[in-house]
């Protein structure tokens, strides 16, 4: 399948314009401070190679590879040295180690500007003026803010974007149209980016295998009427697509996902029978569908595992021969009967069954020694069971923001040597598991909780890996991908923790909190609270509610006061006093 | 003292057989995987072979067809049957206990001192 | 194929010194199943690391073992007089008919 002009090859596949828009994100993704208009210029000038290699492949520097030819355009950047520092280093380096090294320096916390969203009329303007130029500022916002979203997926929220204006600067009330789309699409891309982070991670932290026996977990669990045979060669080319993105290769990552699209819609009948509508959609929505498509039912009368994983008298033959093709086995027919387990909880049980194996196979006896192993899983199945149902419980009795602050309590008590910013915004998506999960039955409550709670505790081991302060963070986040979560929920009150040097400054707050959004002043509130605590680790759940419920009393009692700002100097002052009494600070 | 001892090396001819046996003292067999390693003069080490507690046995690849490891536990002895032996074969040969608790892990904790076995005519 | 490449084939070294052997598998071994062995002349090798970091019981603090996947290191922090020998690392995978040992690096005195 090798061609002479690769760059050719994936122009002539994607198409200039899907072609343009993935170098534009790659480039974003690699230079995350580089102004718009660089980014374009690099982008049209390896637009222009590639298509004089279209037209001759033999063309001189076509037969380069990609990361070649991106690496040598992205080192021609004049101020890499200024803006970037050592990452400047990686173009003294050869392939396949400058992209490597590029891949080193991305940034999942860039210091980037908040995105600011323009007046509805500002925007329409924009995109009525240059809808081309309009939309790939989109797609290179996002990308530089997010190194790792999946580039084809940005594809398609881009599309959407450009729907919503499309429609939208035509309607009558162009805001009550655009913006509820504009928020939907921009917390859809917050949770497709921490999606796939956790994927990039389980990549490349972990290894291929790990992602592999995710993948076997999660689609059997979707496709469970498939062939072990036909879901292995899924997950083989979904693992060489989330290789290729997660490595940089965005145009081989896009074209294979287009592949891999056309294979499961060509062949749905043995893969599964919700993929009709799905496939008959234009290629970023039938990508998208498909990643998304709902569970098929489960195949009537499916046989008890114990037969082959237990009673066979093969058992330990076929693990010792091949352990990923037992294993992988095992793991799918066991995700095929149970939709109602999260991934990960499905990949521990594994490992149980595994760990197992592996101690019984040499013994006298194997089968006395492993027959009781489908035993081992009942308190692994209970455990997270019975803390979902605690805390949608807690969830049904405080509501979101509340839930948020219980949990913004017990995190910077587990970590308090965590930077503020991050527990915040850690905990605050943790807290979003309640709407988001416990509202479903409980044969869906699992599978959405935990493995969301993976995505989220991953944002907590990236942040962290990039300015380590914590050692029980960091246990948690290497020793094992599938334990993040129990290990997290298992983690104490910080005994070693020095308590936080109190500083009013942190506890002063000015006018400008009463113009701020709901979002933002809950956040202004939460970071008070991490402060607090971290300040005072041994102060009560009683302790904190009572000085939140002044905090929140004084806010109120401020933004509806004549002089805003001198009630915020006044009242402070005393609410600091009585918060450091209350607290015994 | 637990023991592992290697015996039955010896000079033999291109295309004859032998039979070793590792002699185990100290502990009972019977509840314990063997492997068999073997290591060419100045060269590094190969693993040839396993026998299970259970009696089940799993060979390298090059290994398959031409060697054979099976056991006795009331002699605490398992042996390695060569055959169709070649100068290549030439090597000290060991015996030696994966770590209890494991079974296709090359974690190898107790070793015997090895036996000579030359191939030459 | 399995290829265990073990680097470098021997190093000179004194006492004191921060010795680091390499291992590297093609393909992957099977989850941390990996091993380092010390062998001396007319002796039969000694088992002093398993699942890529765990030292065996006995085995002096010096020797450590890290890596995963495809790359793993033996370092001895500082090297003692009884630790020159030949090093060995081996390497379980997916089946155990693939059980292999690196060429081995001779650890000698300068």
């Known amino acids: 399948d090798a061609h002479k002009s690769e760059v050719a090859h994936r122009f002539k596949d994607l198409g200039e314009e899907n072609f343009k828009a993935l170098v534009l994100i790659a480039f974003a993704q690699y230079l995350q401070q580089c102004p718009f208009e660089d980014h374009v210029k690099l982008v049209n000038e390896v637009t222009e190679f590639a298509k004089t290699c279209v037209a001759d492949e033999s063309a001189e520097n076509c037969d380069k590879s990609l990361h070649t030819l991106f690496g040598d355009k992205l080192c021609t950047v004049a101020t890499l040295r200024e803006t970037y520092g050592e990452m400047a280093d990686c173009c003294a380096k050869q392939e396949p180690e400058r992209n490597e090294c590029f891949l080193q320096h991305k940034d999942d916390n860039p210091n980037l500007p908040r995105l600011v969203r323009p007046e509805v009329d500002v925007m329409c303007t924009a995109f009525h003026d240059n809808e081309e130029t309009f939309l790939k500022k989109y797609l290179y916002e996002i990308a530089r803010r997010h190194p790792y979203f999946y580039a084809p997926e940005l594809l398609f929220f881009a599309k959407r974007y450009k729907a919503a204006f499309t429609e939208c600067c035509q309607a009558a009330d162009k805001a009550a149209c655009l913006l509820p789309k504009l928020d939907e699409l921009r917390d859809e891309g917050k949770a497709s980016s921490a999606k796939q982070r956790l994927k990039c991670a389980s990549l490349q932290k972990f290894g291929e295998r790990a992602f592999k026996a995710w993948a076997v977990a999660r689609l059997s669990q979707r496709f469970p009427k498939a062939e072990f045979a036909e879901v292995s060669k899924l997950v083989t080319d979904l693992t060489k697509v989330h290789t290729e993105c997660c490595h940089g290769d965005l145009l081989e990552c896009a074209d294979d996902r287009a592949d891999l699209a056309k294979y499961i819609c060509e062949n749905q009948d043995s893969i599964s029978s919700k993929l009709k509508e799905c496939c008959e959609k234009p290629l970023l929505e039938k990508s998208h569908c498909i990643a998304e498509v709902e569970n098929d039912e489960m195949p009537a009368d499916l046989p008890s595992l114990a037969a082959d994983f237990v009673e066979s008298k093969d058992v330990c033959k076929n693990y010792a021969e091949a352990k990923d093709v037992f294993l992988g086995m095992f793991l799918y027919e066991y995700a095929r009967r149970h939709p109602d387990y999260s991934v990960v909880l499905l990949l521990r049980l594994a490992k149980t069954y595994e760990t197992t194996l592996e101690k019984c196979c040499a013994a006298a006896d194997p089968h006395e020694c492993y027959a009781k192993v489908f035993d081992e899983f009942k308190p692994l199945v209970e455990e997270p069971q019975n803390l979902i149902k605690q805390n949608c419980e807690l969830f049904e009795q405080l509501g979101e923001y509340k839930f948020q602050n219980a949990l913004l309590v017990r995190y910077t008590k587990k970590v308090p040597q965590v930077s503020t910013p991050t527990l915040v915004e850690v905990s605050r998506n943790l807290g979003k598991v309640g709407s988001k999960c416990c509202k479903h039955p409980e044969a869906k409550r699992m599978p959405c909780a935990e493995d969301y709670l993976s995505v989220v505790l991953n944002q907590l081991c990236v942040l962290h890996e990039k300015t380590p302060v914590s050692d029980r963070v960091t246990k948690c986040c290497t020793e094992s991908l599938v334990n993040r979560r129990p290990c997290f929920s298992a983690l104490e009150v910080d005994e070693t923790y020095v308590p936080k040097e109190f500083n009013a400054e942190t506890f002063t707050f000015h006018a400008d909190i009463c113009t701020l959004s709901e979002k933002e002043r809950q956040i202004k509130k939460q970071t008070a609270l991490v402060e607090l605590v971290k300040h005072k680790p041994k102060a009560t759940k009683e302790q904190l509610k009572a000085v939140m419920d002044d905090f929140a009393a004084f806010v109120e009692k401020c933004c509806k006061a004549d002089d805003k700002e001198t009630c915020f100097a006044e009242e402070g002052k005393k609410l600091v006093a009585a918060s450091q009494a209350a607290l015994g600070l | 003292e637990v023991q592992l001892l290697e015996s039955g090396g010896g000079l033999v001819q291109p295309g004859g057989s032998l039979r070793l046996s590792c002699a185990v003292s100290?502990?009972?067999?019977?509840?314990?995987?063997i492997n068999w390693v073997r290591q060419a003069p100045g060269k590094g080490l190969e693993w040839i072979g396993i026998?299970?507690?259970?009696?089940?046995?799993f060979y390298a690849t090059w290994a398959k067809g031409r060697f054979t490891i099976s056991r006795d536990n009331s002699k605490n002895t398992v042996y390695l049957q060569m055959n169709s032996l070649r100068a290549e074969d030439t090597a000290v040969y060991y015996c030696?206990?994966?770590?209890?608790?494991?079974?296709?892990?090359?974690?190898?904790?107790?070793w015997g001192q090895g036996t000579l076995v030359t191939v030459s005519s | 194929d399995i290829q265990m490449t073990q680097s470098p084939s021997s190093v000179s070294a004194s006492v004191g010194d921060r010795v680091t052997i390499t291992c590297q598998s093609s393909?992957?071994?099977?989850?941390?199943?990996l091993s380092w062995y010390q062998q001396k002349p007319g002796k039969a090798p000694k088992l002093l690391i398993y699942?890529?970091?765990k030292l065996t019981s006995g085995v002096p603090s010096r020797f450590s073992g890290s890596g995963s996947g495809t790359d793993f290191t033996l370092t001895i922090s500082s090297l003692q007089p009884e630790d020159f020998a030949t090093y060995y690392c081996?390497?379980?995978?997916?089946?155990?008919?693939?059980?292999?040992f690196g060429g081995g690096t001779k650890v000698e005195i300068k």
């Open positions: 026998i299970w507690a259970s009696g089940t046995t």
């Open positions: 030696a206990r994966t770590v209890p608790g494991y079974s296709t892990a090359p974690y190898f904790d107790l």
């Open positions: 081996g390497g379980g995978y997916s089946s155990i008919s693939d059980t292999t």
């Open positions: 699942e890529a970091s």
């Open positions: 100290g502990i009972d067999l019977s509840n314990y995987a």
């Open positions: 393909p992957s071994v099977w989850i941390n199943f």
